[in-house]
Interface confidence: low
Amino acid sequence: AVDLTLLANLRLTDPQRFFLTCVSGEAGAGRGSDAWGPPLLLEKDDRIVRTPPGPPLRLARNGSHQVTLRGFSKPSDLVGVFSCVGGAGARRTRVIYVHNSPGAHLLPDKVTHTVNKGDTAVLSARVHKEKQTDVIWKSNGSYFYTLDWHEAQDGRFLLQLPNVQPPSSGIYSATYLEASPLGSAFFRLIVRGCGAGRWGPGCTKECPGCLHGGVCHDHDGECVCPPGFTGTRCEQACREGRFGQSCQEQCPGISGCRGLTFCLPDPYGCSCGSGWRGSQCQEACAPGHFGADCRLQCQCQNGGTCDRFSGCVCPSGWHGVHCEKSDRIPQILNMASELEFNLETMPRINCAAAGNPFPVRGSIELRKPDGTVLLSTKAIVEPEKTTAEFEVPRLVLADSGFWECRVSTSGGQDSRRFKVNVKVPPVPLAAPRLLTKQSRQLVVSPLVSFSGDGPISTVRLHYRPQDSTMDWSTIVVDPSENVTLMNLRPKTGYSVRVQLSRPGEGGEGAWGPPTLMTTDCPEPLLQPWLEGWHVEGTDRLRVSWSLPLVPGPLVGDGFLLRLWDGTRGQERRENVSSPQARTALLTGLTPGTHYQLDVQLYHCTLLGPASPPAHVLLPPSGPPAPRHLHAQALSDSEIQLTWKHPEALPGPISKYVVEVQVAGGAGDPLWIDVDRPEETSTIIRGLNASTRYLFRMRASIQGLGDWSNTVEESTLGNGLQAEGPVQESRAAEEGLDQ
């Protein structure tokens, strides 16, 4: 593989100090066309992750084999994909680095995923800033999959890619729907062209068995070694702070490789340097771990110590990857010099020993400071050691002191003293302090003085509305940070208590004293605007409105709609009690009225700015009902209706409408228009003989008016079946003369 490394400096407090360096260990690399090969190229790849345009980045060449990119002015400049191209001819290789914003909504648990052909890849995006919305997964910038926000598992959104193939390789992103792409979690998936442990054109060749996290190249079978390791199988560790295929490069700066991400040719991808881990490669390996990203475990035996850069360092007389090859006298292995437990816990203490003859359960014992001897309850026998497990009775403060593990066989004996510290879980002596308050949140300083022992590993804040019997809500916070209690009710008193924990089982202390904190009620600032309205009846109006989109939660409890009737000098107010509402139906309005309408957001008792007003004219209502409707049978098929005009008419009547229905009949009624509004009589013809009918009528001006009273009348005789009712109107006198 080409000796090409892309280094990203991740000290992100100041983007202007950020830099990318591409280093080549190839002979003559980077000297340009006048030397042995093409120059090193280092650039931002904007094909998938585009960021707002800014000042151009500065490229500086440092000697023959190094190129550096600087000139980042703001954090968003850093987000995206960078690539370095080096090597000549068929060996020309591209190394890719993917940068995630530390302030993104979603963060990748692991940026680079190298998997074998046919494997299942699982990309995990951790929720850093929650948004209650879908998560869109994209592959190389194209929509790929959506996850509902309830589908998060333990605060993570997982994308499972079963049976991956080389074309599945690329840049994947997880973005909240309708959020800025810069808040995405970006991943790089590298799919080797072969199954596990294989390489070559038909994947027929066997990989050499790369050590220390090295990855077998699927084309040439060479191990691409993690930064800080060398050798054909990556079996040898470089000195601290060195990298490159022959450990020839030195990490810049006094803190060595801290804060640097190393990207190597595929199929390796990117990782921290040896001895470092974390999203910004600023954390040293935990005890017992070493190598790039601290992914390797030392598992040193027989007193070997774990060096986070190189692995096990064995004492004299021992050797092997884990210092597992040893002399034969019995020996206590890997016993910690100091152990810490919490008061009243019942810990299990393990004591491992090796030797010849092999130690058995009864040959290992544990002695407390008061001289009590504990016998092991269980032993795990492995080829190279026996581990005895001791169940310790409930600890008291007097158990603090030096304990001793002793092994005795016919080959001799060994003992190891270790200190046990019994710690008292912390209990707050004071209530938490309120720093700032808003309508729906309280910012609290949780760290208070406490009795018992530190360090404080976890601070739990318990809170609930004052005088409430509901369960306490609990939030776990970082001991060093202030905490924001979210989604609270405005103008509400909350009882808030702190519970402190120290590391280890049983480290939770009792709850501290409560304090009362009350949420605020700020004035709403958003000005709504009326989107539209439509009349749903002479006295009903449907109104819809919108709010400007602003970052942060909506400050408001609901909306107030105001209708001003200028002619009558009356104001109507309608309260909409949901801040999410964007529409309301106003009923009981006065028909034919000209209203001025506006809407404003309210919060508690405070009103925000009113929308620009709208002017709405409701249609007038219909006229009153005709009076004294009377029906008189004239024959076996005719009935005459007479009536008096309605009183207090708002205008001239355009027509009357008569409703005819057979009494007790199930069919629809028939409506007949009387188009000469001056008339007060009409004859309904074509009725069935000996049939009881129901009649009512109403007048119309611009709209239909109220119905009159209903009258009943039966036709006469036993005539023939008529074809259906029709009407004939005349002046009342003329009809009576006939």
Partner: antibody
């Protein structure tokens, strides 16, 4: 007045296909998330599929994934459900419904319920 | 997947009485994202309550919702004859992935 009218239901043999339509009126169709919900005879409600306003994002219940396709034509104010490889257990009244969708300013959109439903079509 | 379980399966009461229907989620329901529906025989469901306690437009105030986390309640303070129907609870999110409960049948004693 908001109205949703389903059509396209009927009798079909197992393995067959059917396309349901839902004609929407009385509101700005292209602004709303729409869903299909079904109810087998004598049984409860089961969400089938949903589609976002632009039509670019869709969701399916596991029981219909790969067989049913939801789509929409915003110019015709119509929602569709293409049902292939039908099974006896797909027998149900299929309702289309509108999602009462809002954005609580800063927390992303919430879909708090189905505020309007069609009368249903029997498959 | 969040499962919604309603209880009781059937509730027999008389008009004028108080009805209490329960809905339990298999996992915590974020932001009280829960709705209740009423379905009368031969009709489409009707939205009653959303956000666990907010009444939908036009729903009488005898219907009220409460609860948070995993346990939710629908209460009908005084039963009217038209209230006898099947009631469903439903979990919702920002997506359109909905989980309905199996329903509670409210019948006249």
């Amino acid at each position: 007045e908001v109205q949703l009218l389903e059509s396209g239901g009927g009798l079909v043999q197992p393995g067959g296909s059917l396309r349901l339509s839902c004609a929407a009126s009385g509101f700005t169709f292209s602004n709303y998330v729409m869903v299909w919900v079904r109810q087998a005879p004598g049984k409860g409600l089961e969400w089938v599929s949903g589609i976002y306003p632009s039509g670019g994002h869709t969701k399916y219940a596991d029981s219909v994934k790969g067989r049913f396709t939801i789509s929409r034509d915003n110019s015709k104010n119509t929602l569709y459900l293409q049902m292939n490889s039908l099974r006896a257990e797909d027998t149900a009244v299929y309702y289309c419904a509108r999602v009462n969708y809002y954005d609580s300013s800063g927390y992303g959109p919430i879909a708090p319920g189905l505020d309007y439903w069609g009368q249903g079509t029997l498959v | 997947d969040i499962q919604m379980t309603q209880s009781p399966g059937t509730l027999s009461l008389s008009p004028g009485e108080r009805a209490t229907l329960f809905c339990r989620a298999s996992q915590r329901v974020t932001s009280n994202s829960l709705a209740w529906y009423q379905q009368r025989p031969g009709q489409a469901p009707r939205l009653l309550i959303y956000d666990a306690s907010t009444r939908a437009t036009g729903i009488p105030d005898r219907f009220s919702g409460s609860g948070s986390g995993r346990d939710f309640t629908l209460t009908i303070s005084r039963l009217e004859p038209e209230d006898f129907a099947v009631y469903y609870c439903q979990r919702y999110g920002s997506s359109v992935l909905y989980s309905f409960g199996q329903g509670t049948k409210l019948e006249i004693t």
